[in-house]
Interface confidence: low
């Protein structure tokens, strides 16, 4: 790790598109990128009458909205579509929902990683 | 520094077919999906596409499936686009462009572009 | 397919003013979203990544924002070197759909 912060090789892999988009389903999804850019994990879900229905998971691009995040957690209040992004190998795997001002139940990723995806 | 160059264009029949090929150097060509985007002459860009870095993944715009294959030979650092069936509408600069990351997210290298007029 | 609406399709503006062009997706698509810059004759080149990311090379004012449906790319004093044609793209999913592009002209 470079000043304490966890780098990001691979993040869990999912896509509810996978079919469409003609990729794996899920797997491990190894994180390229520029040497001097940080990487990032993601996760984004919707809450469909309580129940969750993972969109998409895996690597995210270098974005400040992510640093030094070892928690993937949604913060918005009621987004239509949720997202969170953290560092560090899976990082991903469990994501949650805490809006800021209000209390609510964490939300578990139930995603099994598969063998390796790559692009 | 990366390059991408492409070749093949030319003036062809409806009906007729084009090889196009993108021949690339720089970066890590077979750690990179790639894609190929068109242009019409005084147009917008339109996605045509794309391969994974090993050909196990293939994507297609509905406007070309069935008459266009994208391959790459990972040994000659090279992409191609096979074009039959050649349209009218299908005239416009073709480029080639190389995926910032694994995960799609944006075209961060482009060629040149290569002009394809299908005409009679 | 996604489709992607651009803003305004053309602009005239002077050097020093500040540009804000918008594009707007069919559905949500996270922060799935580029900004290329294309001159007359030349290849697109990239600028935003991401929605909000600056591509290596690309000056301090040019920024974009955005997520979800709606999204801004910014240049905040126009420069010569700027008068081009600006597409957003969508890469949330295949097929990969392009803006239909602003023109920024010279007043």
């Known amino acids: 790790a470079i000043l304490g912060r966890s780098e990001t090789q691979e993040c869990l892999f999912f896509n509810a598109n996978w079919e469409k988009d003609r990729t794996n389903q899920t797997g491990v999804e190894p994180c390229y990128g520029d040497k001097d850019k940080r990487r990032h994990c993601f996760a984004t879900w919707k809450n469909i009458s309580g129940s969750i229905e993972i969109v998409k998971q895996g690597c995210w691009l270098d974005d400040i909205n992510c640093y030094d995040r070892t928690d993937c957690v949604e913060k918005k209040d009621s987004p239509e579509v949720y997202f969170c992004c953290c560092e560090g190998n899976m990082c991903n795997e469990k994501f949650s929902y805490f809006p800021e001002m209000e209390v609510t139940q964490p939300t578990s990723n139930p995603v099994t990683p598969k063998p390796p995806y790559y692009n | 520094e990366v390059q991408l160059l492409e070749s093949g264009g030319g003036l062809v029949q409806p009906g007729g077919s084009l090889r196009l090929s993108c021949a690339a150097s720089?970066?890590?060509?077979?750690?990179?999906?790639m894609h190929w985007v068109r242009q019409a002459p005084g147009k917008g860009l339109e996605w045509v596409s794309n391969?994974?870095?090993?050909?196990?993944?293939?994507g297609y715009a509905d406007s070309v499936k069935g008459r266009f294959t994208i391959s790459r030979d990972n040994s000659k650092n090279t992409l191609y686009l096979q074009m039959n069936s050649l349209r009218a509408e299908d005239t416009a600069v073709y480029y080639c462009?190389?995926?910032?990351?694994?995960?799609?997210?944006?075209?961060?290298?482009w060629g040149q572009g290569t002009l394809v007029t299908v005409s009679s | 397919d996604i489709q992607m609406t651009q803003s305004p399709s053309s602009l005239s503006a002077s050097v020093g003013d500040r540009v804000t062009i918008t594009c707007r997706a069919s559905?949500?698509?996270?922060?799935?979203v580029n900004w290329y810059q294309q001159k007359p004759g030349k290849a697109p080149k990239l600028v935003i990544y991401a929605a909000t990311s600056r591509a290596s090379g690309v000056p301090s004012r040019f920024s974009g924002s955005g997520s979800g449906t709606d999204f801004t790319l910014t240049i905040s004093s126009l420069q010569p070197e700027d008068f081009a044609t600006y597409y957003c793209?969508?890469?949330?999913?295949?097929?990969?759909?392009f803006g239909g592009g602003t023109k920024v002209e010279i007043k």
């Open positions: 391969i994974n870095y090993n050909g196990g993944y293939t």
């Open positions: 793209q969508q890469s949330y999913e295949l097929p990969l759909t």
């Open positions: 720089g970066f890590t060509f077979d750690d990179s999906s």
């Open positions: 462009a190389k995926s910032a990351n694994w995960h799609d997210t944006a075209l961060d290298y």
């Open positions: 559905q949500s698509i996270l922060s799935y």
